[in-house]
């Protein structure tokens, strides 16, 4: 009986099992019972990343500088090009098809996680006892100054956006 299923790295065609083409190669002609599958290497700027029976290789991804993209890893005949974003930008999706500017953390918020080429800045509100008085891509929330440690007294309470203001203690007290 002719086969109805084939081994790994084979495919069924015309009642027989043919070898798949290895990664980096495309199918030119199916095997016969007299000759093996004919495969050809992918051309420049093309790839196939699996054992396959594709008659065309895929084009490497183009990292368009107009979209803020640059090449992180050059593609081979077996792998696609990996794009990342220019400094100060991050990918809008996992496929990294375009980039957007990193957002800054506003006053009252500190940087919890600095942005990378693939992820945006993560901000967090400054908790009580901490403040941030500027928009920043890197700065964390800073602790309020301790007036007590300086033998000073609090003249003005701190907020999430402002530091405590200390002054000399009132001697009449």
């Amino acid at each position: 009986e002719p086969p109805t299923a084939c081994r790994e790295k084979q495919y069924l065609i015309n009642s027989q099992c043919c070898s798949l083409c290895q990664p980096g190669q495309k199918l030119v002609s199916d095997c016969t019972e007299f000759t093996e599958t004919e495969c050809l290497p992918c051309g420049e700027s093309e790839f196939l990343d699996t054992w396959n029976r594709e008659t065309h290789c895929h084009q490497h991804k183009y990292c368009d500088p107009n979209l803020g993209l640059r090449v992180q890893q050059k593609g081979t005949s077996e792998t696609d090009t990996i794009c990342t974003c220019e400094e100060g930008w991050h990918c809008t999706s996992e496929a990294c098809e375009s980039c957007v500017l990193h957002r800054s953390c506003s006053p009252g918020f500190g940087v919890k996680q600095i942005a990378t080429g693939v992820s945006d800045t993560i901000c967090e509100p400054c908790p009580v006892g901490f403040f941030s008085n500027q928009s920043s891509l890197f700065e964390k929330c800073y602790p309020w100054t301790s007036c007590e440690d300086k033998n000073l007294e609090v003249l003005q309470k701190g907020t999430s956006q402002t530091n405590v203001i200390c002054g000399p203690q009132d001697r009449l007290r």
Epitope: P2, Q16, S29, E33, F34, T35
Partner: antibody
Framework: EVQLLESGGGLVQPGGSLRLSCAAS????????MSWVRQAPGKGLEWVSG????????YYADSVKGRFTISRDNSKNTLYLQMNSLRAEDTAVYYC??????????WGQGTLVTVSS | DIQMTQSPSSLSASVGDRVTITCRAS??????LNWYQQKPGKAPKLLIY???SLQSGVPSRFSGSGSGTDFTLTISSLQPEDFATYYC?????????FGQGTKLEIK
């Protein structure tokens, strides 16, 4: 025991026809691809034609394409080669062979075809 | 068609010698190559398939190697019955094609 026995060879004039047969025994004939290979006197081997098992696809060397036809009769366990428009350069011993995993593991003893006027 | 070129075309050797026959394909055929032995007046016999696999019943003194375009058949210690003509045959592209043969003669 696997056996392949060719017949039908002989002397034929240029432009003439001949039909070779190969009687198979000792194995399940229908399950195997079969081929014809020839050898001109004092020369090397030349693959002429092949026929698949289940699909029955047929394949030919460019030198015989359009002139030779390979066929099989699984009920008779017999392989055929119909040779038309024969030329002097077709003179050779013709072998039938069984295929397994892209190799010819059993061969007949051959039949001589002579094309001459 | 893929051209198969064997070298040498003929060679003389003695019983017990180690002999190497080479076969070169005009383009890459991976490991899709067979070797056959033919004695005068007889049909060819399959020795090696898939470049390096020994056909059942063939003595272990025969071995094959190579891939891509360059292949070798080695007989480690020649026996009297090994004097014959050897052919390589590719099956990487249609149609299958043979080398011109290497005649191994007694010195």
């Amino acid at each position: 025991e696997v056996q392949l026995l060719e017949s039908g060879g002989g002397l034929v004039q240029p432009g003439g026809s001949l039909r070779l047969s190969c009687a198979a025994s000792g194995f399940t004939f229908s399950s195997y691809a079969m081929s014809w290979v020839r050898q001109a006197p004092g020369k090397g081997l030349e693959w002429v034609s092949g026929i698949g098992s289940y699909g029955g696809g047929t394949y030919y060397a460019d030198s015989v394409k359009g002139r030779f036809t390979i066929s099989r009769d699984n009920s008779k366990n017999t392989l055929y080669l119909q040779m038309n428009s024969l030329r002097a350069e077709d003179t050779a011993v013709y072998y039938c062979a069984r295929y397994v995993n892209f190799g010819m593991d059993y061969w007949g003893q051959g039949t001589l075809v002579t094309v001459s006027s | 068609d893929i051209q198969m070129t064997q070298s040498p075309s003929s060679l003389s050797a003695s019983v017990g010698d180690r002999v190497t026959i080479t076969c070169r394909a005009s383009q890459s055929i991976s490991s899709y190559l067979n070797w056959y032995q033919q004695k005068p007046g007889k049909a060819p016999k399959l020795l090696i398939y898939a470049a390096s696999s020994l056909q059942s019943g063939v003595p272990s003194r025969f071995s094959g190697s190579g891939s891509g375009t360059d292949f070798t058949l080695t007989i480690s210690s020649l026996q009297p019955e090994d004097f014959a003509t050897y052919y390589c045959q590719q099956y990487g592209r249609n149609p299958p094609t043979f080398g011109q043969g290497t005649k191994l003669e007694i010195k």
